[in-house]
Interface confidence: low
């Protein structure tokens, strides 16, 4: 019997910046039970907190709700795991609400084929932004990602959009049945899911792009 | 097209109040932080504040938190600021603004003046 | 809260000019910054949002630079719709806080 091996927390996300959660790996339990705690402080200020919610984000997690979560100033946060021979802390992690952001897949993807007289036939897809996420205050740009394949390929072809909420692709194969994803993140955080796949019908008249 | 229209602004007395609409067409007034930003006679700009997108949030600077108030009214498109406790430096533009993604928008203004 | 300043307060030039305004901040604001450009009776038209991107419609003469404290906005080649003041603004924390503005008259 042991105390316990060194806990380590491992991920934090926030789904719009307003809220967050950070998850911790326990170490070894030296065989004995082992309680688990979450202290954090902002930095700048000594006053240590102990985690506000455990129950929200699952097992060996702390949920910072909008109450706790401060857009503008780092956390600081450590786990102590303790049994009856002992504790041990993790190492301290740095939490910045800004560069954890991991946003919901992007919305209202639709996808259609466009046949201009004068030009190729292209597709043409477009997208919102989750709602969740506020565009403006406290960071500003959403850079998103497009799949495409056709519905019995293994492969997917991706595509760079930027900033941009609409994207054009020209080479496609005629009569085929295409899956179309859409993905965001903000620039300093994670890729959102991808969005539910849309599908799109290519006619067998679709002429390729030389 | 994007366009914002407020109205409501004019002469009132310092102690005085005032209620200032904007009215948002052109994009989904919903889904969007709203400012107010005020400009002196002859001087710069002044964020007055914001508000989330369903209300339940707003941010104020400090010379005005306690005397003025912005709401909104989503089915109408309306965004408000109500002015209490004026005062002769509360005296300027106010323009109503979105917060978009990609940078603000701008009603061209109503003029509020503070004076005995 | 944090102070945007500006400089030069105001600036004579020509057309065909090349003008670069400078703005600083009290505190780092990463690229939390727009920049606006105001006619006289007009409401402000924002030109560029986080630092260096260029809002829709606006011409490529203008650009952005900037991280942390100190920002730039240039005008390549000074045409006669860009005499105008123009402010720039941080938007990393509250309040959002503007700059004294810089005025760009006719030299």
């Known amino acids: 019997q042991l105390p316990p091996g060194k806990p380590e927390i491992f991920k934090c996300r926030s789904p719009n910046k307003e809220t967050f959660t950070c998850w911790w790996r326990p170490g070894t339990d030296g065989g004995l039970p082992t309680n688990y705690s979450l202290t954090y402080h902002r930095e700048g200020e000594t006053l240590m907190h102990e985690c506000p919610d455990y129950i929200t984000g699952g097992p060996n997690s702390c949920h910072f709700g909008k109450q706790y979560t401060s857009m503008w100033r780092t956390y600081v946060m450590m786990v102590n795991a303790t049994n009856q021979m002992g504790s041990s802390f993790s190492d301290e992690l740095y939490v910045d609400v800004t560069y954890i952001v991991q946003p919901d897949p992007p919305l209202e993807l639709t996808v259609e084929v466009k046949q201009p007289e004068d030009r190729k036939p292209y597709l043409w897809m477009k997208w919102s932004p989750p709602t969740l996420i506020d565009l403006k205050t406290g960071w500003f740009t959403l850079l998103y990602e497009i799949r495409l394949k056709p519905e019995k390929a293994a492969e997917w072809e991706t595509h760079f959009a930027g900033q941009q909420t609409e994207f054009k692709i020209l080479s496609l194969h005629p009569g085929q049945k295409y899956l179309v994803q859409v993905r965001c993140k903000p620039d300093h955080g994670y890729w959102s899911a991808w969005s539910p796949a849309t599908f799109i019908q290519i006619p067998s008249d679709f002429i390729m792009n030389d | 097209e994007v366009q914002l229209v407020e109205s409501g602004g004019g002469l009132a007395q310092p102690g005085g109040s005032l209620r200032l609409s904007c009215v948002a067409s052109?994009?989904?007034?919903?889904?969007?932080?709203m400012s107010w930003v005020r400009q002196a006679p002859g001087k710069g700009l002044d964020w007055v504040g914001n508000?989330?997108?369903?209300?339940?949030?707003?941010n104020y600077v400090d010379s005005v938190r306690g005397r003025f108030t912005i709401s909104r009214d989503n089915a109408k498109n309306s965004l408000f600021l109500q002015m209490n406790s004026l005062r002769a430096e509360d005296t300027g533009v106010y323009y109503c603004?979105?917060?978009?993604?990609?940078?603000?928008?701008w009603g061209q203004g109503t003029l509020v003046t503070v004076s005995s | 809260d944090i102070q945007m300043t500006q400089s030069p307060s105001s600036l004579s030039a020509s057309v065909g000019d090349s003008v670069t305004i400078t703005c600083r901040a009290s505190?780092?604001?990463?690229?939390?910054l727009d920049w606006f450009q105001q006619k006289p009776g007009k409401a402000p038209k924002s030109l560029i949002y986080?630092?260096?991107i260029l809002q829709g419609g606006v011409p490529s003469r203008f650009s952005g630079s900037g991280y942390g404290t100190d920002f730039t906005l240039t005008i390549s080649s000074l045409q006669p719709e860009d005499f105008a003041t123009y402010y720039c603004?941080?938007?990393?924390?509250?309040?959002?806080?503007f700059g004294p503005g810089t005025k760009v008259d006719i030299k």
């Open positions: 603004a979105t917060l978009l993604t990609k940078g603000d928008y």
């Open positions: 052109g994009f989904t007034f919903s889904t969007y932080w």
């Open positions: 508000i989330k997108q369903d209300g339940s949030e707003q």
């Open positions: 505190q780092d604001i990463s690229n939390y």
């Open positions: 986080a630092a260096s």
């Open positions: 603004r941080q938007y990393k924390t509250y309040p959002f806080t």
